[in-house]
Amino acid sequence: TQHGIRLPLRSGLGGAPLGLRLPRETDEEPEEPGRRGSFVEMVDNLRGKSGQGYYVEMTVGSPPQTLNILVDTGSSNFAVGAAPHPFLHRYYQRQLSSTYRDLRKGVYVPYTQGKWEGELGTDLVSIPHGPNVTVRANIAAITESDKFFINGSNWEGILGLAYAEIARPDDSLEPFFDSLVKQTHVPNLFSLQLCGAGFPLNQSEVLASVGGSMIIGGIDHSLYTGSLWYTPIRREWYYEVIIVRVEINGQDLKMDCKEYNYDKSIVDSGTTNLRLPKKVFEAAVKSIKAASSTEKFPDGFWLGEQLVCWQAGTTPWNIFPVISLYLMGEVTNQSFRITILPQQYLRPVEDVATSQDDCYKFAISQSSTGTVMGAVIMEGFYVVFDRARKRIGFAVSACHVHDEFRTAAVEGPFVTLDMEDCGYNIPQTDESTLMT
């Protein structure tokens, strides 16, 4: 999607975690027919591997060709490998599909590092562990790519779930979810529960384990605890939201809230880290360093380059602070906060040297394109992309990794004034002069 290496994210083992499970609150919204409840056939339909993306099984063409597709709320193209590539076990073979239609148009998507290009067409698409429907959707058949596919990731394409405004080559190319809603009775919302394992998974464990759930067209109560809190989607391009305050262990970073959203804040399942604007990143790291000062870590750790390891089972979670992001609420002058633990922002990785240790990378990094709430945030929560009501909901995920002392949280309301002014207004530029 937008920039840099948007390494997708990590998955994990399903089910409720050991330890604390929050009681369900009773003051939830009234039921909306067809939108809430149980979606058994879609629960546990995601898999993945640490830092490499959550993917869902999809079928394309007639007869159906099965592919694993990365779920990405930070882009808007449905694009699949359509030619041999060393990292692909399989790819979309258009010539074998009787329902393929060529749009006779190319598409080129460059990133800061890497790119993909392909040919546009349409075909019949369905999601085996999704709604029981088939839709004709736009497909970018990737014929050439560089640093896009990931060796061993087990996915062969990408499902961009954001809005048409950021679709390539332009906003006239209808995204998959728009086609799905237009052609079927599926309600215009989806929800994601991404489950971090809390420890590294090898290839066979990934294939056997559950990485989470993508509920298409609804909300499944079994996937979260407590209440859902909603923040408005500021503008329908990325899933853009407004952050009004940031705290480290309850201490306000005390920055002008515009800085938190410079030049935007988005919810992006296709990014591993919590990415923060330069000034915010520097202030946050300074505060996290101070809070965890009982142990010293090399500079490379805070830059996300170096691992830090502890003897198996001895990770000192308690020395690391919780991080709270306050989001604009749906009600005027009201915000709510989402709080993540070090279990979310320290990403488990396999140490090449020894498997006796538990090793982690710092999964908060610097951004020049605004705040990106990637897997580090999403793995703590059940996230509802309520496109119909132009809002995003957060509740504590039933599968988030925590310990017996602390849990991720979604809490509110907090009286907060003039929140609209926390949003940054990106200057309108002639699109022809923009570089991706």
Epitope: V244, V415, T416, L417, D418, C422
Partner: nanobody
Framework: QVQLQESGGGSVQAGGSLRLSCAAS????????MAWFRQAPGKERGGVAT????????YYADSVKGRFTISQDRAKNTVYLQMNSLKPEDTGIYYC???????????????????WGQGTQVTVSS
Amino acid sequence: QVQLQESGGGSVQAGGSLRLSCAASEYTDSTYYMAWFRQAPGKERGGVATLASRYDTTYYADSVKGRFTISQDRAKNTVYLQMNSLKPEDTGIYYCAASPRRPGFFPLDPSQYNYWGQGTQVTVSS
């Protein structure tokens, strides 16, 4: 630099009333939030009531809703806190505070305020 001076504190029986005043050295116009905070013995300073002077909009801590009223007299550069049905737990030092208007403002959070008065003691006995 805004200077703030509180007055009106004192001792009162539970159920009684007091009216606190906060005089500002220069008028805290539409660009300011004005607030009252209290600090009970051995506790942190907590928000009681806030006034967004531009709109005469008010915000109250749950514990004082329906009992306390914050208001202003622009002509006198003064903000008031009318306290009715006082309880022993309302005892503490009451501070007046001011802050320039800014986005993403948490009106009952003391860390958001730049200017403070010296405080006035309120004691409520049972």
